[in-house]
Amino acid sequence: QDSPPQILVHPQDQLFQGPGPARMSCQASGQPPPTIRWLLNGQPLSMVPPDPHHLLPDGTLLLLQPPARGHAHDGQALSTDLGVYTCEASNRLGTAVSRGARLSVAVLREDFQIQPRDMVAVVGEQFTLECGPPWGHPEPTVSWWKDGKPLALQPGRHTVSGGSLLMARAEKSDEGTYMCVATNSAGHRESRAARVSIQEPQDYTEPVELLAVRIQLENVTLLNPDPAEGPKPRPAVWLSWKVSGPAAPAQSYTALFRTQTAPGGQGAPWAEELLAGWQSAELGGLHWGQDYEFKVRPSSGRARGPDSNVLLLRLPEKVPSAPPQEVTLKPGNGTVFVSWVPPPAENHNGIIRGYQVWSLGNTSLPPANWTVVGEQTQLEIATHMPGSYCVQVAAVTGAGAGEPSRPVCLLLEQAMERATQEPSEHGPWTLEQLRATLKR
C-alpha cells in the first residue's frame, strides 16, 4: 500500500576530521520508495563536480572535503561552522524533512587566556600554576609538562582544575620549567614556559641583603633578526648588566621598559618582562620606530631590589609590513575618489607619514603615482574619459613605502552615469576580474 515518506534515520551533528570523507546518513520509509535530496543551509546541493558532495544509493551523503562557508545565519559566525545539512525524502504522496545536522570543523586558536607565570614557592607550602587555554572547538583539554616531559600527576599532591595545576606540598624536586599544553582534534598549542623555583623556608635577612644589591645596566643592543622568524620579525634587544653587592642574593632579574614620551610629557607605564639570564638576556616584543627606555630590577621571591640605571635606545623605522586596508574607488564628477584605511597598528613599524598611490598601466590612466602626506586616507584623481581605472596604495614610514594593496579597479562607462565597482556582492573588482570582464 502506498504511504508518504517518513524519516527513519536523521543526520547527526558531526565534526569534519579529514583527510577521509565525512558521512551524513539519512534513511526514509515510504511507498513508492522516496527519493532523497540534500540541502545545505536550506539550499539544494547540486552534486555536480566541482561540488564536493556525493550521494550514495542508500541516501548517505559523502562530503569529500569541507564546503566553502556559506552565509552565516548567526551573525558574526565562528570559523568552525560549515553549515546545517537537512535531507528531504519525497514521493508522489509528499515530502518529509529531516532534522538539521550541523557540520563543523575543528579549530584551536593560538592565544592563551592565562599564561603560567614564573614563580618562587616554599618547600611544604602549596602553589598554583594558572593556565587558561585558547578557544577551541571541540573544547581543548589541558595537560602539564615539566622540563619537556609530560608531568606525572600524583593523586593527593597534584590537581588539575579548570586548566590550572595545584601542587599541594612543594618539594625541591618540583623545581623546573612548566608548560601548559592545550589539545583538541585540530592540534595542540603550548603555553610559555614558566620557571618554578623552590626554596627552603626563609629567615628575613634576604630582603635586607637584596636592598644592598647594585645593578649597572651596561649595554642595550639591537639584535639582528633571526631569518627563521620569517621576513618581518619583531625587534629584540640584548641587555647586559653587572651586579655588585652581597653574594648574588637575587634569584631573578626583570627588564622594565617603556616608550619614551616627549620631554615634559607624562611617562608611559613601565612594562615588565622576566629575563632568562643573570648577567645578560634577550628582550623581545618591541616595536620598530620607537624610542625606548630600559632598566633592570633584581628580585628574590616577593622581595625586590633597587632598579638599575636607565639606558635609551632608538629602534629604527622599517617599512610597513602590511598594506592599507579596505581600498575603494568611487566615481565623482569628472574624478575618481580613492579611499583606504591604514594598515593594522601592529604592522606600522614606525610612524606612518603618508601614502603612495599608483595607477597601473594598460588602463585609462597612464602609469603614475601620487604622494598623500600625513594622516589623510583619501585622494581625488581627475578623469578625462570612460574606461577602467586601477590603483594600488602603500603606507609610507621614514624607511620608505611598504607592501602595496591588491590592485582595485573601477569601470567608468561611456556616459559616466553608472560606474561598476561591485560585481554581484563580491566586493571591489580585482585586476583579474576586470580583465575577464573586458575580454567578454
Epitope: R109, Q113, W135
Partner: antibody, heavy 118, light 112 residues
C-alpha cells in the same frame, strides 16, 4: 537572529544569594564562549565572568572570585550566574554577552537589574 | 590589573563634524603572539552596549564606515568622520588581552 534574554534579577539582602539565567537562541550556543558584564548605576561597565564553550574553563575578576560562579547548560542553551554573599556594591544591571572566540563580545542581552539592599 | 583611561570623558560635538576619542592602557595590550585585543562599544541611552570596533581597527558588521579605530601598544583612538544624531551615547573601550578584562570609564558624546 541572535537573541540573549536575561532573567532572575531582583531585590536581595546583603549576604543573600541570587541566580541569573540567560536564554540564548538564534545561534549554536555550544560553540561560543559566553560572559557576564555588569553596570552599576551611573558607572562604567565591569566584566564579571567568562565561561568557555564547553564549560570547563571559567574566568573571574578578583572582585567576585569565590562568590560568583558562571555555568552553562548547552542542552538547554542557557547561561547562568550564581551569586552568593552579595554586597551592596554588587547592585547593577547584569548583561550576558556572546563571545567570538575570546576576542570580543558581539551580542548583548537587554540586562536584568540586581539590587542588594537591606 | 590593566587600568584603562579615556579622554575626553565628555565630548560635545556638532552634527556633520568629526570626533575623536582616546583610550590608554596602563600596560601594552599586545600579547606574545603580536595580537592586540582592544574593542570599542557604544551604549546608547537606555540600551545595552553594541559592538563598533574589534581588535583595534576592524569594523563590526553593520557598523557605518564613518567609525574607524586605530592604535597600538598602549594608545588607541576611535574616530567618527562625520557625527550623526544617532551616534550620541557613551563610548567604552575594552581590553581582553589580559585577564581580568577591563573597560575604560566611558566617553559621553552629545550634540552641542
Amino acid at each position: 537572529e541572535v537573541q540573549l534574554v536575561e532573567s532572575g534579577g531582583g531585590l536581595v539582602q546583603p549576604g543573600g544569594s541570587l541566580r541569573l539565567s540567560c536564554a540564548a537562541s538564534g545561534f549554536t550556543f555550544s560553540t561560543y564562549a559566553m560572559s557576564w558584564v555588569r553596570q552599576a548605576p551611573g558607572k562604567r561597565l565591569e566584566w564579571v565572568a567568562t565561561i568557555s564553550n564547553g564549560g570547563t574553563y571559567t574566568y573571574y575578576p578578583d572582585s567576585v572570585k569565590g562568590r560568583f560562579t558562571i555555568s552553562r547548560d548547552n542542552a538547554k542553551n542557557t547561561l547562568y550566574l550564581q551569586m552568593n554573599s552579595l554586597r551592596a556594591e554588587d547592585t547593577a544591571v547584569y548583561y550576558c554577552a556572546r563571545l567570538i572566540y575570546y576576542d570580543y563580545l558581539d551580542y548583548w542581552g537587554q540586562g536584568t537589574l540586581v539590587t542588594v539592599s537591606s | 590589573d590593566i587600568v584603562m583611561t579615556q579622554s575626553p570623558l565628555s565630548l560635545p560635538v556638532t552634527l556633520g563634524e568629526p570626533a575623536s576619542i582616546s583610550c590608554r592602557s596602563s600596560q601594552s595590550l599586545e600579547n606574545s603572539n603580536g595580537n592586540t585585543y582592544l574593542n570599542w562599544y557604544l551604549q546608547k541611552p537606555g540600551q545595552s552596549p553594541q559592538l563598533l570596533i574589534y581588535r583595534v581597527s576592524n569594523r563590526f558588521s553593520g557598523v557605518p564606515d564613518r567609525f574607524s579605530g586605530s592604535g597600538s601598544g598602549t594608545d588607541f583612538t576611535l574616530k567618527i568622520s562625520r557625527v550623526e544624531a544617532e551616534d550620541v551615547g557613551v563610548y567604552y573601550c575594552l581590553q581582553v588581552t589580559h585577564v581580568p578584562w577591563t573597560f575604560g570609564p566611558g566617553t559621553k558624546v552629545d550634540i552641542k
